[in-house]
């Protein structure tokens, strides 16, 4: 167990030209308020995934109002740190998501009105115990500096906040086979209080005699690594030797959500969707106010006016969740058109076009004959973003530029014979045939299958082809 | 300033069948594209039938065969037509459009809502 903390040290305009309009007026005086969210391991970092190692809101800054003209400055911020606390081990790689929130106090009908200013994300390795991190993040215009650190809730010590220490029961040396406690060097490492061969780097315990393992490894003791590669058994892996994860008890047997909670299984762990009023990993922390602004993105809190009574969120078109922190997939509705791939991006939708369109909705077919002259008389078609060249008789190729031999494809029927003609090609008809390519016998009668030939020739004449 | 305005929704017995209505109105250029949400009860929101972009109609696998969206391109609205109704259609029902303005400028809009509840 222990603490994530999380120290703001400026929220203000960013180096570089377009210097961002302060976000309050002298009409509409406002004030910050900064919300962090952690998620174990390197995950994606959609700010709609909950945030499974915990969240937190900051207190109010102090209330701001801009003087007419002069540029934004590094805003007043609220004091103190942020603190998520988390219960169990510190999984040493984290996503982190901080919002910067402006909370209006104009005359605003219902309440203050709360808006996003500014979101950054990064992925980080952080080992618990050590000194503060510092940081710098731009979104947009806006920069963010910041500092964090994970320390470990005594007893626990060590990088991941795994290791018991307890104070020295003798002042000169620690007990039989226990070692001093870096860097609590007056402390001793608890007794082995976990299950005889639990491995002290990939398992930990909370409860004496119990081995609960750290991400990536599973077995009775946390010896053996976790695979990806595939495994037949429901639960994935199923044999210990290969590193398969072990049938059994999943992870949400026993129901870990506290408070009415309720649990589904992920890849990797387990998800509790929590009732109002409740959340954290397991649904433990209750006692959320509308006094502390539980609602983002605009939503209106009602209700909860003491920690026994549960607040609700009235969310604004386009969010949803129990605090409005989960956007509608408004991709789902195919906005982008000619096969553009799709983009919410919170404030605005936004279109990826395929090569050969442009525009906002790639509506947009770019002109690909612009410029491009089809050589000897073609004629430039446009279609699908690329540009094709529909050639003059006599001319192939990607611009024209290439003679064709008109007889190449043997078009004359029936052993007729080709000639190359400036105006296309002529058929000369073997005996019985004739047509344009000697297609049509010509009957033993002298009638022709087909409309006699045109006046002027006679069955087995060279018949030019226009 | 756009507009989606809705109306329709109601109580109805499963089997029944309701017909929703969504007029745009304001600033519109044009209407890119244009279709239904929906929100059960403690649910997250999601597409049930749409215009796209490219003109296409699209439905969620729920409701296919039951729910026909159509549209009146002159009056700027779309209807969606809901046939042999189950329980599991109670919902708020959000008409949604992206459109484009007169600024040329697409904005993305979501109507007020119609609860719509099927007795089963």
């Known amino acids: 167990a222990g603490v994530f903390e999380l120290q703001i040290h400026s929220f203000g305009p960013g180096p570089g030209p377009g210097a961002p309009r302060s976000p309050c007026s002298a009409r509409l005086p406002c004030r910050l308020f900064f919300r962090v969210c952690l998620k174990p391991g390197l995950s994606e970092e959609a700010a709609e995934s909950p945030c499974a190692l915990g969240a937190a809101l900051s207190a109010r800054g102090p209330v701001y109002t801009e003087q007419p003209g002069a540029p934004a400055p590094d805003l007043p911020l609220p004091d103190g740190l942020l603190q998520v606390p988390f219960r169990d081990a510190w999984p040493g790689t984290f996503s982190f998501i901080i919002e910067t929130w402006r909370e209006e106090l104009g005359d605003q009908i219902g309440g203050p009105a709360w808006s996003l200013l500014a979101r950054v994300a990064g992925r980080r390795r952080l080992a618990a115990g050590g000194p503060w991190a510092r940081d710098i993040q731009r979104a947009g215009a806006w920069e963010l500096r910041f500092s964090y650190r994970a320390r470990c809730e005594p007893p626990a010590v060590g990088t991941a906040c795994t290791r018991l220490c307890r104070p020295r029961s003798a002042p000169s040396r620690c007990g039989p086979g226990l070692r001093p406690c870096a860097p609590l060097e007056d402390e001793c490492e608890a007794p082995l209080v976990c299950r005889a061969g639990c491995s002290p780097e990939h398992g930990f315990c909370e409860q004496p005699g119990e081995c609960r393992c750290l991400e990536g490894w599973t077995g009775p003791l946390c010896t053996v690594p976790v695979s990806t590669s595939s495994c037949l058994s429901p639960r994935g892996p199923s044999s210990a030797t290969t590193g398969c994860l072990v049938p059994g008890p999943g992870p949400c047997d026993g129901n870990p959500c506290a408070n009415g909670g309720s649990c589904s299984e992920t890849p990797r762990s387990f998800e509790c969707t929590c009732p109002r009023g409740f959340y954290g990993l397991r649904c433990e922390v209750s006692g959320v106010t509308c006094a502390d602004g539980p609602c983002f993105n605009g939503g209106l809190c009602v209700g909860g006016a003491d920690p026994d009574s549960a607040y609700i969120c009235h969310c604004p078109p386009g969010f949803q969740g129990s605090n409005c922190e989960k956007r509608v997939d408004r991709c789902s509705l195919q906005p982008c058109r000619n096969g553009g791939l799709c983009l919410d991006l919170g404030h605005a939708l936004r279109c990826r076009c395929r090569a050969g369109f442009a525009g906002p909705r790639c509506e947009h077919d770019l002109d690909d004959c612009a410029g491009r002259a089809c050589a000897n008389g073609g004629t430039c078609v446009e279609g699908g973003g690329a540009h094709r060249c529909s050639c003059a008789l006599g001319f192939g190729g990607r611009d024209c530029r290439e003679r064709a031999d008109p007889c190449a494809a043997r078009p004359c029927a029936h052993g007729g014979r080709c000639y190359a003609h400036f105006s296309g090609l002529v058929c000369a008809c073997a005996p019985g045939y004739m047509g344009a390519r000697c297609e049509f016998p010509v009957h033993p009668d002298g009638a022709s299958a087909l409309p006699a030939a045109p006046p002027g020739l006679r069955p087995g004449d060279p018949q030019r082809y226009l | 300033e756009v507009q989606l305005v809705q109306s329709g929704g109601g109580l109805v017995q499963a089997g029944g069948s309701l017909r929703l209505s969504c007029a745009a109105s304001?600033?519109?250029?044009?209407?890119?594209?244009m279709g239904w949400y929906r929100q059960p009860p403690g649910k997250q929101r999601e597409m049930v039938a749409g215009?796209?972009?490219?003109?296409?109609?699209i439905y969620a696998d729920s409701v296919k065969g039951r729910f026909t969206i159509s549209r009146d391109n002159a009056k700027n609205t779309v209807y969606l037509q809901m046939n042999s109704l189950k329980p599991e259609d109670t919902a708020v029902y959000y008409c949604a459009a992206d459109v484009q303005l007169f600024s040329r400028d697409y904005e993305f809009y979501w109507g007020q809502g119609t609860q719509v509840t099927v007795k089963p």
């Open positions: 215009f796209t972009g490219d003109g296409n109609t």
């Open positions: 304001g600033s519109i250029l044009s209407i890119n594209a």
